[in-house]
């Protein structure tokens, strides 16, 4: 029995921890009965052959965040009981081919964040019990065929952030038990057909942040157990029909940050378990009817930061469970009155940063549970009578940064806003843009003696022609000096009184959700 090395701490003798920059060589002697050894944040640069000979009971060895650059071939000799080995966050460039031959009972091997430039085909040949292999953050430019062939028990493999540009279609062919495969942050430009065919138990496939331009139509057809598929931040410009057809268990799909221009009807489905679909930051210009009709369990649909100028009236058919719909930061000028008709469970809709000039009075007709509507930074001059009357749960309505035209036609909206001011939040109220006589005044607290909707006379010098000369048709001209008589049967009725919402995010979408 050895005592604890002076530079280490030993709890119950079997757990040894050695940390600190003052350690420049492997501490010794180590307690013979040590079962867990952690060597962290030291300046150790080398691992000689004989340092673990007397601690054969060791189960877990964690040598992380050191300066380790060189490991002798026999360094792990006599560690037949070792189950968990981490050499992450060191400076390893190469590993001796036979380095792991005596630790053939390993279950986890963590080699992330080193400088490994290659893996020998025989490097992992004895690891039939290995469950997890982490190679994230190295410099592996390619993966040789056969390198994983003996890892038949592997369930988790991380090859992210290495910089390789292509994969052999046979590299994963013996990994039938693999559940998590992470290939993100590489430079893959295309993935050969068949690459994932052997991965029948795969649950997570992470391909985000590569340079993938096209997807083979049958690429995922053998991955019927896939639950999470990350394809974001690639160069995908087209989704082949049927690409997601064999994924009945998929519940999360990210496609944001690609170059998608269109979505063909039926491309998403059937995926009865999909809960979230992230499509923001693409180049989508329009949505056809039934674009998402097979996604009847979808709860979150993020389409912000695209170039949408047209949404077909039936684009959202079938999305009966949708809760969050993000359409902000697009080029929408008009919306069909039925576009949200099937979204009976919608709670939050974000339409800000578009070019909406008007909204149909029926746009929210069937969406009775709406809690937040974001309409700020659009081109709205007025809103139809009664557009929000039935929305008893509405808590947050953003209307600022629109060029509201405060003539007599605005009175019903003005009255409704007064009665429902709490719903506008406490930060910013809508303000009149025209006519010039009331510009800058709050639409909520402005005097009710609005000018009529007659054609305007000369404006003050500040006014450009762009926002202010587009007057309403002069069908009900009222002298601008006439006091407007309010009718008592305006369609803007009072809603249930609610307390002001102080926290803007209480009912709003998170930044992540809104894209």
């Amino acid at each position: 029995y050895y005592g604890c090395p002076s530079e280490c701490t030993c709890s119950r003798a079997s757990q040894v921890e050695c940390t600190g920059a003052q350690i420049v060589a492997m501490p010794s002697p180590l307690p013979w009965n040590a079962m867990s050894l952690q060597i962290l944040n030291t300046h150790i640069t080398e691992l000689p052959e004989d340092k673990f000979l007397n601690i054969s009971a060791l189960i877990a060895l964690k040598m992380e965040k050191n300066e380790l650059a060189n490991i002798m071939p026999g360094a792990f000799r006599n560690l037949g009981s070792l189950r968990h080995l981490s050499l992450a966050n060191n400076k390893l460039k190469n590993l001796p081919v036979r380095l792991f031959q005596d630790v053939n009972n390993l279950e986890t091997l963590l080699l992330s964040n080193n400088q490994l430039v290659q893996i020998q085909p025989a490097q992992f040949s004895q690891f039939s019990n290995l469950k997890e292999l982490q190679l994230y953050g190295n410099n592996l430019e390619y993966i040789p065929e056969g390198v994983f062939d003996h890892l038949v028990g592997l369930t988790k493999l991380n090859l992210g952030n290495n910089g390789f540009t292509h994969l052999s279609p046979r590299v994963f062919q013996h990994l039938g038990n693999l559940q998590v495969l992470r290939l993100y942050e590489n430079r893959l430009s295309d993935i050969p057909m068949g690459t994932f065919d052997a991965l029948g138990n795969l649950q997570e496939l992470a391909l985000q942040e590569n340079q993938i331009g096209t997807l083979s139509p049958g690429l995922f057809h053998n991955n019927r157990n896939l639950q999470r598929l990350y394809l974001s931040n690639n160069h995908i410009s087209h989704l082949p029909p049927g690409i997601f057809m064999q994924l009945p268990h998929l519940n999360k799909l990210t496609l944001f940050g690609n170059s998608l221009k269109e979505l063909s009807p039926g491309v998403f489905g059937p995926m009865p378990n999909l809960r979230e679909l992230w499509l923001y930051n693409n180049h989508i210009t329009s949505l056809p009817d039934n674009a998402f009709s097979h996604l009847n369990q979808l709860q979150v649909l993020i389409l912000s930061h695209n170039q949408l100028s047209y949404i077909s009236p039936g684009a959202f058919n079938g999305l009966t469970n949708l809760r969050e719909l993000s359409l902000h930061t697009n080029a929408l000028q008009d919306l069909d009155g039925n576009v949200f008709r099937s979204l009976a469970n919608l709670r939050n809709v974000s339409l800000q940063n578009n070019r909406l000039r008007q909204l149909p009075g029926s746009i929210f007709a069937n969406v009775n549970g709406l809690m937040t509507i974001q309409l700020q930074n659009n081109n709205l001059e007025n809103l139809p009578l009664g557009i929000f009357d039935h929305l008893g749960n509405l808590c947050e309505l953003r209307l600022y940064d629109n060029p509201w035209r405060c003539d007599s036609n605005i009175l019903p909206l003005h009255d409704w806003l007064i009665l429902n001011r709490a719903r506008l939040g406490t930060d910013t109220l809508p303000v009149c843009s025209s006519p010039a006589s009331v510009r800058g005044q709050s639409l909520v607290i402005i005097n009710v003696n609005f000018p009529g909707p007659s054609v305007q006379g000369p404006e003050t010098p500040e006014v450009s022609s762009y926002p202010d000369t587009s007057s309403y048709p002069d069908s009900t001209s009222i002298s601008s000096t006439t006091e407007i008589t309010r009718s008592t049967d305006d369609d803007y009725t009072d809603l249930n009184t609610i307390e002001p919402i102080d926290d803007r995010n209480t009912w709003g979408m998170t930044d992540a959700q809104s894209g």
């Epitope: 080029a331 060029p403 843009s433 450009s464």
Partner: antibody
Framework: QVQLLESGGGLVQPGGSLRLSCAAS????????MSWVRQAPGKGLDWVSV????????FYTDSVKGRFTISRDNSENTLYLEMNSLRAEDTAVYFC??????????????WGQGTLVTVSS | IVLTQSPSSLSASVGDRVTITCRTS??????LGWYQQKPGKAPKLLIY???SLQSGVPSRFSGSGSGTDFTLTISSLQPEDFATYYC?????????FGQGTKVAIKR
């Protein structure tokens, strides 16, 4: 009449910071979006950033995202551009411009005369 | 979105009809404006929404087009029109200018 007066330009080393200001007068400042547009010496126009009338919406060109911040003080009728981690390619005359409406559109009916930012070691 | 103006420069005489084109790499509906800039001066808005004449701009200037192809026409070139002309799209962030077309006096 509408006036826009930029200030805050000058010589700065790469990696340095500057804060540009644009004092506005002659119009209801809070009811118009405002933008910054730059022009490198002898080159064309390059849109930099826009902010809506309330300041609630801001957008940037890709090359300045994370380095520049547009803001406005509607009580002081002033537009700002905070520029950090400046690079040689940021060298340009910076114009502030008034949009024709409160929401963010790229149609600017009044411009300042510009302030020169030089990034050089 | 990339905007490509043509020609990059042209020479014309007073009274000439001048046409400048702006082509966008993606469809932008009519979200395009035209600006005029003279040396040492700030730009001036001429046309917005592809074809609407800005207040105070002479009627000899006109704009047309939609989708990806846009045109600025000066029906009868005047001495004060010699300048550089830029198109700008604001359909999609980041907004982008064309590279400019310089209209010079023909010698």
């Amino acid at each position: 009449q509408v006036q826009l007066l930029e200030s805050g330009g000058g010589l700065v080393q790469p990696g340095g910071s500057l804060r540009l200001s644009c004092a506005a007068s002659g119009f209801t400042f809070s009811t118009f979006a405002m933008s910054w547009v730059r022009q490198a010496p002898g080159k064309g126009l390059d849109w930099v950033s826009v902010i809506s009338g309330t300041g609630g919406s801001t957008f940037y060109t890709d090359s300045v995202k994370g380095r520049f911040t547009i803001s406005r003080d509607n009580s002081e009728n002033t537009l700002y551009l905070e520029m950090n981690s400046l690079r040689a390619e940021d060298t340009a005359v910076y114009f502030c411009a008034k949009a024709v409406t409160v929401n963010t559109r790229g149609f600017f009916d009044y411009w300042g005369q510009g302030t020169l930012v030089t990034v050089s070691s | 979105i990339v905007l490509t103006q043509s020609p990059s420069s042209l020479s014309a005489s007073v009274g000439d009809r001048v046409t400048i084109t702006c082509r966008t790499s993606q469809v932008i509906r009519n979200d395009l404006g035209w600006y005029q800039q003279k040396p040492g001066k700030a730009p001036k808005l001429l046309i917005y929404d592809a074809s609407s004449l800005q207040s105070g701009v002479p009627s000899r200037f006109s704009g047309s087009g939609s989708g990806t192809d846009f045109t600025l026409t000066i029906s009868s070139l005047q001495p004060e029109d010699f300048a550089t002309y830029y198109c700008l799209q604001d359909n999609n962030y980041p907004w982008t200018f064309g590279q400019g077309t310089k209209v010079a006096i023909k010698r």
